[in-house]
Amino acid sequence: FGISGKHFITVTTFTSAGNIGEDGTLSCTFEPDIKLNGIVIQWLKEGIKGLVHEFKEGKDDLSQQHEMFRGRTAVFADQVVVGNASLRLKNVQLTDAGTYTCYIHTSKGKGNANLEYKTGAFSMPEINVDYNASSESLRCEAPRWFPQPTVAWASQVDQGANFSEVSNTSFELNSENVTMKVVSVLYNVTINNTYSCMIENDIAKATGDIKVTDSEVKRRSQLELLNSG
């Protein structure tokens, strides 16, 4: 390694969020080094003895891996030489939340960076016209959220209006007793208007839009993670 111990390399991480029960990615990049065998990647988690993951000499080394991560982690091995040290995490759990350190040692030097990993549940909302209701109403449903989000309605025509008096929101615990199904109904809607259902917690914000006219119904949904770094 020669002078590697005397030089610092730039390591960059991004605060990210994991959707429980799905794959997650802990993002980390570093100054590339074409000598794959000289690259060591170590992922650590605050409060955990042992490693989250280690990759060295071109392959994974799980000899010091903590049991809670056994069989749940992998680096993108073919992207390590171009400076990608991101970690793939299987079946994200609430307990995976915390502060992680991405530590890199290459022939050019060494460096590290921390990232805050948040875990929860978030999903796209779907808005439909509720024809069962006595008056025309809209039903906004999203299958998985945690922690409990806030739900707000907005309308293109009545901008700034408060719809809390004419809407009803419920949170139904899903079968695994962690995440919840969000259902919100907006009453007394008018046609030729666009309505938005906004669901938000400290991890994600999702919006569902619906445009109702005499001839058609148009829908659109989007989801954004509320990253702080």
Epitope: G21, E22, D23, H53, K59, D60, D61, L62, S63, R70, G71, R72, T73, A74, A77, R88, K90, N91, R144, N174, S175, E176, T179
Partner: antibody, heavy 121, light 107 residues
């Protein structure tokens, strides 16, 4: 391409043990978990357990703890499963399979051809 | 331990038709469900993983969907070579679990 070659069929006596092998080729043996499954006619598949040859780490289905022992030999890229105290209930086809995703335990993406074990006196 | 209840156990369908098989997990939730095709004398073949991701080389006639505890697998435009046993695998937890299998016959 990824290949898993399993040892041949065996006829064994009740109460004895049998050790079957699964030789891997076409990928880095130490970097992927290898899983084992049991198939009996009319019973579908049952998960036995898996092993990470890179460190010898194992996971077992509680039902097969004490019955199955999983090992791996890095030098020959071969995984082994020993079954002990055999009874007629152990008569089945046993499959080994590579778990996709490297150190991440994924789905069973490449399978061996199976080893048929018949337990009979 | 998680159990995967697969249904139906057998079905018969016409050439060119469509079939759907379901697997229900006894508990938990995650997207780690795979679907396999198994023909007599052959080793099982992975068709779909992570609920809906098609393996390379598998035709788009095969599809998967689901969330929570309920997962489904469909084959459309059925062909004679689709006659086989199909089964699901839950691989999200430490202990993996198989569905009981569905034997498909093409008429």
């Amino acid at each position: 391409q990824v290949q898993l070659q399993q040892s041949g069929a065996e006829l064994v006596r009740p109460g004895t043990s049998v050790k079957m092998s699964c030789k891997a080729s076409g990928y880095t043996f130490t970097s992927y978990w290898i899983g084992w499954a049991k198939q009996r006619p009319g019973h579908g598949f049952e998960w036995i357990g898996d092993i990470y040859p890179g460190g010898g780490y194992t996971n077992y289905n509680e039902k097969f703890k004490g019955k199955a022992t999983l090992t791996a030999d890095k030098s020959s890229s071969t995984a082994y499963m020993q079954f002990s105290s055999l009874t007629s209930e152990d008569s089945a086809i046993y499959y080994c399979a590579r778990l996709d995703g490297s150190s991440y335990r994924g789905a069973m993406d490449s399978w061996g051809q199976g080893t048929s074990i018949t337990v009979s006196s | 331990d998680i159990q995967m209840t697969q249904s139906p156990s057998s079905l018969s369908a016409s050439l060119g038709g469509k079939v759907t098989i379901t697997c229900k997990a006894s508990q938990g939730f995650n997207k780690y469900v795979a679907w396999y095709q198994h023909k007599p004398g052959q080793c099982p073949r992975l068709l779909i993983h992570y609920t809906s991701t098609l393996q390379p080389g598998i035709p788009a006639r095969f599809s998967g969907s689901g969330s929570g505890r309920d997962y489904s697998f469909s084959i459309s435009n059925l062909e004679p070579e689709d006659s086989a046993t199909y089964f699901c695998l839950q691989y999200g937890n430490l202990l993996y679990a198989f569905g009981g299998g569905t034997k498909l016959e093409i008429k």
